[in-house]
């Protein structure tokens, strides 16, 4: 791989543009932060491949590593990649932002780690401090990576001075995990039970031959002990299981169940906990809100989603105008209820290519023997507006009228406008709005009708023009929440013997 400029470190000016080129014997690609930025790839006549990455309007946030690598590493040195580090000194950017994974540094052993506070300018002096501490710590700094060393369990910040301003980084939290050689897992047949039902928990340890289990649970605190059963899972090497079974649970059995496992040879121990909830009776609870008025657009698909919690598992029914809905054979309606966690459900009604007739009152009912919940909403089908007719006439009264008729849902608004200078309007001059009460030369009369069967509004608007002294382009625009439509007509004065 050949990279130009070769680097390995470049310092570029803020706001500038810079071009990086990489070429190789197989397809190559530039990578930045594990992604491929937009770049131009090409193959030359001599069979070499290249990729050109153009960095435009550079800011401090462009500071970082850039890699060129083979796009398809089959049959090639798989790990051949060229690294380039670019600095873009930018006084407006202090420390480069970190994501949460970089701010919290977890260790399982005493080992060297890096606190990844990085700046945009390699000339800046950066110091490391304990959070809320003034004393700089004697730890080596690499402008491309950060501070590397062996750190205690503390929180740390980096400091630098940009111009005359002292800048602090986010705090970095170093935490040493207490890792034991015992690997414990706890699970329950179910974490929510009704009183009278059974609670069954299992605690499994892997990789130990002799261990001691100790359970703590709400019943134990009141002195009512339950004897766990310990067995070996014979199909797996050194898998030991302890089962805690509480028949006929009571409300007081709700709480945290902890399995503590100790192994005395090396004095290792581990524990895991799980929460169990005992409910007096089953429940169904809606989560979140669904508005009482929902919208769908004609001929588009629409999914209506209800999220709820329930135990035990409920039956879910959907109704439209009090009639039960089912998956239609024509594929116009799809119903699904998914169990997304132990007690959480998502029920979806999908209307495929919505029709006017699908407007109406919808209800979802979720129920079991102990409880039920229902959620209702009105579904309105929105129909894009369209102008059906635009006509001009001149009755005997001497005035001229233009009639515009259109339909849509929700109710369309009508806007009348006119161009008096046909050469320059509307390209150079904006059209004049008509029909305002202040305008004496035009009057407007608008009627709205709701057509029940088609479930849409019809708007008929008549514009009366008092005296037209030269040709006029009159435009009728209808607009609603899902669209707009326009038609125009040329109105000529009575005296002119022709129409354009």
């Amino acid at each position: 791989l050949v990279v130009t400029p070769p680097g390995p470190e470049l310092v570029l000016n803020v706001s500038s543009t810079f071009v990086l080129t990489c070429s190789g014997s197989a397809p190559v690609v530039w990578e930045r932060m594990s992604q491929e930025p937009p770049q131009e790839m090409a193959k030359a006549q001599d069979g070499t491949f290249s990729s050109v990455l153009t960095l435009t309007n550079l800011t401090g946030l462009d500071t970082g590593e850039y890699f060129c690598t083979h796009n398809d590493s089959r049959g090639l040195e798989t790990d051949e990649r060229k690294r380039l580090y670019i600095f873009v000194p930018d006084p407006t950017v202090g420390f480069l932002p970190n994501d949460a994974e970089e701010l919290f540094i977890f260790l399982t052993e005493i080992t060297e780690i890096t606190i990844p506070c990085r700046v945009t300018d390699p000339q800046l002096v950066v110091t490391l401090h304990e959070k809320k501490g003034d004393v700089a710590l004697p730890v080596p700094y690499d402008h491309q990576r950060g501070f590397s060393g062996i750190f205690e369990d503390r929180s740390y910040i980096c400091k630098t001075t940009i111009g005359d301003r002292e800048v602090d980084s986010d705090a970095y939290y170093v935490y040493r995990l207490q890792v034991s050689s015992i690997n414990v897992s706890v699970n329950a047949v179910q974490t929510v039970v009704r009183q009278g039902e059974n609670i069954t928990l299992m605690c499994i340890v892997i990789g130990n031959e002799v261990v001691n289990f100790e359970w703590t649970y709400p019943r134990k605190e009141s002195g009512r002990l339950v004897e766990p059963v310990t067995d070996f899972l014979l199909d797996m090497p050194y898998h030991i299981r302890s089962i805690l079974h509480i028949p006929s649970a009571e409300l007081e059995d709700s709480g945290t169940y902890t399995c503590n496992v100790t192994e005395s040879v090396n004095d290792h121990q581990d524990e895991k906990a799980i929460n169990i909830t005992v409910v007096e009776s089953g429940y169904v609870r809606l989560l979140g809100e669904v508005g009482t008025l929902q919208f769908a657009e004609l001929h588009r698909s629409r999914t209506l989603q209800v999220v709820f919690e329930a135990y035990p598992p409920p039956t879910v029914l959907w109704f439209k105008d009090n009639r039960t809905l089912g998956d239609s054979s024509a594929g116009e309606i799809a119903l699904s209820t998914r169990n997304v966690s132990e007690t959480r459900y998502v029920s979806e009604l999908t209307l495929v290519r919505v029709k006017v007739a699908e407007a109406g009152h919808y209800t979802m009912r979720a129920f079991h023997e102990d409880a039920e919940v229902q959620l209702s909403f009105q579904l309105q089908i929105n129909v894009p507006v369209r102008v059906l007719e635009l006509s001009e006439s001149h009755p005997d009264s001497g005035e001229q009228t233009v009639r515009c008729r259109g339909r849509g849902m929700p109710q369309p608004n009508i806007i009348w406008s006119a161009c008096r200078d046909l050469k320059r309007c509307p390209r150079e001059l904006p059209p004049t709005l008509l029909g305002n009460s202040s305008e004496e030369e035009s009057q407007l009369e608008t009627n709205v009708t709701y057509w029940e069967e088609e479930q849409e509004f019809e708007v008929v608007s008549t514009l009366r023009l008092q005296h037209v002294d030269r040709p006029l382009s009159v435009r009728c625009t209808l607009r609603n929440a899902v669209g707009q439509d326009t038609q125009e007509v040329i109105v000529v004065p009575h005296s002119l013997p022709f129409k354009v």
Epitope: D99, L103, F104, A171, Y173, P218, T256, A273
Partner: antibody, heavy 127, light 107 residues
Framework: EVQLVESGGGLVQPGGSLRLSCAAS????????MSWVRQAPGKGLEWVAN????????HYVDSVKGRLSISRDNAKKSLFLHMNSLRAEDTAVYFC????????????????????WGHGTTVTVSS | DIQMTQSPSTLSASVGDRVTITCRAS??????LAWYQQKPGKAPKLLIF???TLESGVPSRFSGSGSGTEFTLTISSLQPDDFATYYC?????????FGQGTKVEIK
């Protein structure tokens, strides 16, 4: 300087609505969980709600579920609390706080407390 | 929900005294407990997290201990700046609960 500044409090009638804002500065807002905590006059602290870094996970105390809603705008480094159907018992000083919840470690969550707090904004619900 | 109970509610002490505040959880919370200090008209300040880890910048006279359901905050030698209200707070699957508070006042 790491700072949180709340605003939007005021006097509102029972059943009314209010939106509280919290402006963050001096840290990478988008990398932290954030919480709202309230304190009724002369009373102790009550945690109200929190939200993860990208807004995909929220949690509420039972007494406010369905009435109060937490949201955030990472681009504007702001946290919000949308308050509806307000009751007299919602009268309190509302604090926003940075919640130090690291990313999950295997099957374990760690927690380092609420280390940065705003000065608070007062909400009074009264007719 | 997990309830947190602090005792005592009020504590009268003198400068130099050793002060201990107790916090009890209604069920085991391992060591997911934090302690805060609050002065009148001010925001709370984090003192200790994970039951015993001192927050940066907090004087070493403050210490925390305990696990499971019983926790204590100790001030080894009370200073004039320490007269305030102290709250414990549990963390469990992202929900939080504070204790009702312990006011440390001048004897």
């Amino acid at each position: 300087e790491v700072q949180l500044v709340e605003s939007g409090g005021g006097l509102v009638q029972p059943g009314g609505s209010l939106r509280l804002s919290c402006a963050a500065s001096g840290f990478t807002f988008s990398s932290y969980w954030m919480s709202w905590v309230r304190q009724a006059p002369g009373k102790g602290l009550e945690w109200v709600a929190n939200m993860n870094q990208d807004g995909s996970e929220t949690h509420y105390v039972d007494s406010v579920k369905g009435r109060l809603s937490i949201s955030r705008d990472n681009a504007k480094k702001s946290l919000f609390l949308h308050m509806n159907s307000l009751r007299a018992e919602d009268t309190a000083v509302y604090f926003c706080a940075r919640d130090l919840v690291p990313p999950r470690q295997d099957d374990y969550y760690y927690y380092f407390g609420m280390d940065v707090w705003g000065h608070g904004t007062t909400v009074t619900v009264s007719s | 929900d997990i309830q947190m109970t602090q005792s005592p509610s009020t504590l009268s002490a003198s400068v130099g005294d050793r002060v201990t505040i107790t916090c009890r959880a209604s069920q085991s919370i391992s060591d997911w407990l934090a302690w805060y200090q609050q002065k009148p008209g001010k925001a709370p300040k984090l003192l200790i997290f994970k039951a015993s880890t001192l927050e940066s910048g907090v004087p070493s006279r403050f210490s925390g201990s305990g696990s499971g359901t019983e926790f204590t905050l100790t001030i080894s030698s009370l200073q004039p700046d320490d007269f305030a209200t102290y709250y414990c707070q549990q963390y469990n699957s992202y929900s939080r609960t504070f204790g009702q508070g312990t006011k440390v006042e001048i004897k």
